[in-house]
Amino acid sequence: HNTTVFQGVAGQSLQVSCPYDSMKHWGRRKAWCRQLGEKGPCQRVVSTHNLWLLSFLRRWNGSTAITDDTLGGTLTITLRNLQPHDAGLYQCQSLHGSEADTLRKVLVEVLADPLDHRDAGDLWFPGESESFEDAHVEHSISRSLLEGEIPFPPTS
């Protein structure tokens, strides 16, 4: 699998999309996992609803959400309030039995907030009653890794 890079701004939301063949993966739950090292295991962060028919319902684990358009064949992961420690290599997975097929490898890059040096008086913060997701348009910049580019720093 090629690795697709998604870039988001610290403090904002990042939306990652993973397209797949909806018939090939019919009936299969999906998951989002974080790769631990270049050859390490992929640690499950969040998975879709236990009932596949309810996969469209958004499920959260901490600041990460997952939802699956099983008809259109798009898995969507939202990383809310993106932080520098969220940067790293992830996978979108299709689950069958205890196994997982990789749908897409994703490198999340976190960019510094261009506003974070301004006077706080110039910033707008959502009120307590307002939804964070309403306050920030979810967005991402994505690209595929160039050949030879490596998502992990080389180990000595």
Epitope: D21, W26, G27, L51, W52, L53, L95, G97
Partner: antibody, heavy 123, light 107 residues
């Protein structure tokens, strides 16, 4: 009606090549996985591998990897199992089976089977 | 690979009897297990999937139970057409593996 129709019995000599087929009908062939299962005379069932005809994604059992090739031609709704050099130990009944995922289980089971192709390898 | 072990390897019973076949997996497979029936010269037929779900058209005298490593197939009242060989199969991981089979014979 879902049907998997396999090619007829084959008698071959050791070292010869062979390709047997499994034609699906009554459902969307490109959208379902097809598995191949071996049954040696008087023995149990052995899963050889599986293919998704839509994009030819194939998985093999380690026991059969490199021994056989699984392929599919989605334009004629047919899956194949082939050998480049048969051995006497390949003598068996070979079944193809459709693999169906049950949505509340997220795994797959073989719900429709072909009638089987008997392959006899003898000098 | 996950090993599937069935017991007994053969069983003799009479019409009307209750018969139980067991299947043990070498490691936990949750409820990802199927049972198939095979008659001589025929292809296997899916009876039960997900350990306990009956396939459409399969008589209710067949039932499956278990999870993890231990599973059972029960035929509550044997009918003449039930004499056949039964196989369990794990659907947990690749390669898919089958039990060695249990031959159900007429006493």
């Amino acid at each position: 009606e879902v049907q998997l129709v396999q090619s007829g019995a084959e008698v071959k000599k050791p070292g010869e090549s062979l390709k047997i087929s499994c034609k699906g009908s009554g459902y969307s062939f490109t959208s379902s996985w097809i598995a191949w299962v071996r049954q040696m005379p008087g023995k149990g069932l052995e899963w050889m591998g599986i293919i998704y005809p839509g994009d030819s994604d194939t998985r093999y059992s380690p026991s059969f990897q490199g021994q056989v090739t699984i392929s599919a031609d989605k334009s004629i709704s047919t899956a194949y199992l082939q050998w480049s050099s048969l051995k006497a130990s390949d003598t068996a009944m070979y079944f193809c089976a459709r693999s169906r995922t049950f949505y509340y289980d997220s795994s797959d089971y073989f719900d429709y089977w072909g009638q089987g192709t008997l392959v006899t390898v003898s000098s | 690979d996950i090993q599937m072990t069935q017991s007994p390897s053969s069983v003799s019973a009479s019409v009307g009897d209750r018969v139980t076949i067991t299947c043990r997996a070498s490691q936990g497979i949750s409820s990802w297990l199927a049972w198939y029936q095979q008659k001589p010269g025929k292809a296997p037929k899916l009876l039960i999937y997900a350990a306990s779900s009956l396939t459409n058209g399969v008589p209710s005298r067949f039932s499956g139970s278990g999870s993890g490593t231990d599973f059972t197939l029960t035929i509550s009242s044997l009918q003449p057409e039930d004499f056949a060989t039964y196989f369990c199969q794990q659907a947990d991981s690749y390669p898919r593996t089958f039990g060695q089979g249990t031959k159900l014979e007429i006493k």
